[in-house]
């Protein structure tokens, strides 16, 4: 049994960071490995996760952690029973993926505005929680040509758009992801979409 | 109430051997790093030797590293401290200590924030 | 090895009157925001160490609130903003950062 793919992980710089690797040949994960896990730090013990299967080869740990801070630095052991099949490092504040947004409400009854609100992921007392900016795509059910993305680089969870901007008498879906500059982030996973009806009065044209 | 109690301290000859015992209580042991600090007669505090709530974690002072053994038997809530090749400069006052919480990822510290009355080592011939 | 430097190593207090304790580290002891790791010990004379302060500013529980600690990365200091008689013996600054865990030389603090 050997590693095909090392382990790669990301964390959500919050509780938990998802390792992933392939195995050279199909491989009951939870059964026939363990990742251990241990923080490099004084008096610190080892934890261990159980992966699951993802894909024939493939496994994914979720690692359990309390918190996240930048100096925290883990060792990584991959084991199948009694054989060390693989030892590496993990520093979570270097490989961050944000958690998704949450919550996306669409409002429509501003008059002739669209407002997008959304939650953040991350509580107040998370280092993520002020230093997250946004990707808000919105798209057309009917024309997969109307799609496009709005970049919120202030704090506030909310975008505000004109109505008129969008086609009227048509449904349109929204999603919103994260990332946070300051640990140069990879993007969250999308937050699931949301649907509306958009519809506005359009302006009386004079002659 | 949380208490630690040694025992096990004496007088030996340099080159003997003592095992010193710590026993815990008011708290949940195994969940504990524990820590033996000791003191020379008329000197400041030295720490001796700690160990993770698993005793999976081991961590020795130069000055008793390949002498000492830290151990611990959580069946039985207690911190062990066995001394071999007892020298002069040994002689003090052991004190042990509840360390930080050690079944977290991190290790939750709290400060050495309990401490037993201390038991006298004296080597001497 | 971190070594904790303490000043002064003598210090005669007036009653009521304020005490303030250094201690230096030669390495930082921050390791994130907020964690200074560390602690301050009284010894009273014939009696095991006791904490005041851990994590540099954490006061333990069932200390007064007389006592105070400050300082972060390699700078922390104790104060003692109204001594008393039962405050007088040995003050330690310890650090737990790194083993070996290190304590400074002690602080004697007696009445005037």
């Known amino acids: 049994m050997k590693v095909l793919q090392e382990p790669t992980c990301v964390s959500d710089y919050m509780s938990i960071s998802t390792c992933e690797w392939k195995m050279n040949g199909p491989t009951n994960c939870s059964t026939e490995l363990r990742l251990l896990y241990q923080l490099v730090f004084l008096l610190s013990e080892a934890h261990t996760c159980i992966p699951e299967n993802n894909g024939g080869a493939g496994c994914v740990c979720h690692l359990l952690m309390d918190d996240v801070v930048s100096a925290d630095n883990y060792t990584l052991d991959l084991w199948a029973g009694q054989q060390l099949l693989w030892k590496g490092s993990f520093k979570p504040s270097e490989h961050v993926k944000p958690r998704a947004p949450g919550n996306l409400t669409v409002h429509t009854n501003v008059s002739d505005t669209l407002l997008l609100t959304w939650s953040n992921p991350y509580p107040p007392d998370n280092y993520l929680y002020n230093h997250l900016t946004y990707a808000v795509n919105i798209w057309s059910e009917n024309d997969p040509a109307d799609f496009r993305i709005y970049n919120v680089t202030y704090l506030e969870p909310s975008l505000r758009i004109a109505a008129s901007t969008l086609k009227s008498g048509i449904s349109y879906r929204a999603r919103v992801r994260a990332w946070a500059q300051c640990y140069n982030t990879t993007w969250s996973e999308w937050s699931p979409s949301t649907k509306w009806h958009n519809s506005y009065r359009e302006p009386f044209e004079q002659h | 109430e949380v208490q630690l109690v040694e025992s096990g301290g004496g007088l030996e000859q340099p080159g003997g051997s003592l095992r010193l015992s710590c026993a815990g209580s008011?708290?949940?042991?195994?969940?504990?790093?524990m820590t033996w600090v000791r003191q020379a007669p008329g000197k400041g505090l030295e720490w001796v030797s700690s160990?993770?709530?698993?005793?999976?974690?081991?961590y020795y002072a130069d000055s008793v590293k390949g002498r000492f053994t830290i151990s611990r038997d959580n069946s039985k809530n207690t911190l062990y401290l066995q001394m071999n090749s007892l020298r002069a400069e040994d002689t003090a006052v052991y004190y042990c200590?509840?360390?930080?919480?050690?079944?977290?990822?991190?290790?939750?510290?709290?400060?050495?924030?309990?401490w037993g009355q201390g038991t006298t080592v004296t080597v001497s011939s | 090895d971190i070594v904790m430097t303490q000043s002064p190593l003598s210090l005669p207090v007036t009653p009521g009157e304020p005490a303030s304790i250094s201690c230096t580290a030669s390495q930082s002891l921050l390791y994130s925001i907020g964690y200074n790791y560390v602690d301050w010990y009284l010894q009273k004379s014939g009696q095991s160490p006791q904490l005041l302060i851990y994590?540099?500013?954490k006061r333990a529980s069932g200390v007064p609130d007389r006592f105070s600690g400050s300082g972060s990365g390699t700078d922390f200091t104790l104060k003692i903003s109204r001594v008393e008689a039962e405050d007088v013996g040995f003050y330690y600054c310890?650090?737990?950062?790194?083993?070996?865990?290190?304590f400074g030389q002690g602080t004697k603090l007696e009445i005037k």
């Open positions: 310890m650090q737990s950062l790194t083993s070996p865990y290190t």
């Open positions: 994590l540099g500013s």
């Open positions: 008011g708290f949940t042991f195994r969940t504990y790093a």
């Open positions: 160990i993770s709530g698993s005793g999976g974690n081991i």
């Open positions: 200590a509840k360390d930080r919480v050690s079944i977290y990822v991190r290790p939750r510290y709290y400060g050495l924030d309990v």
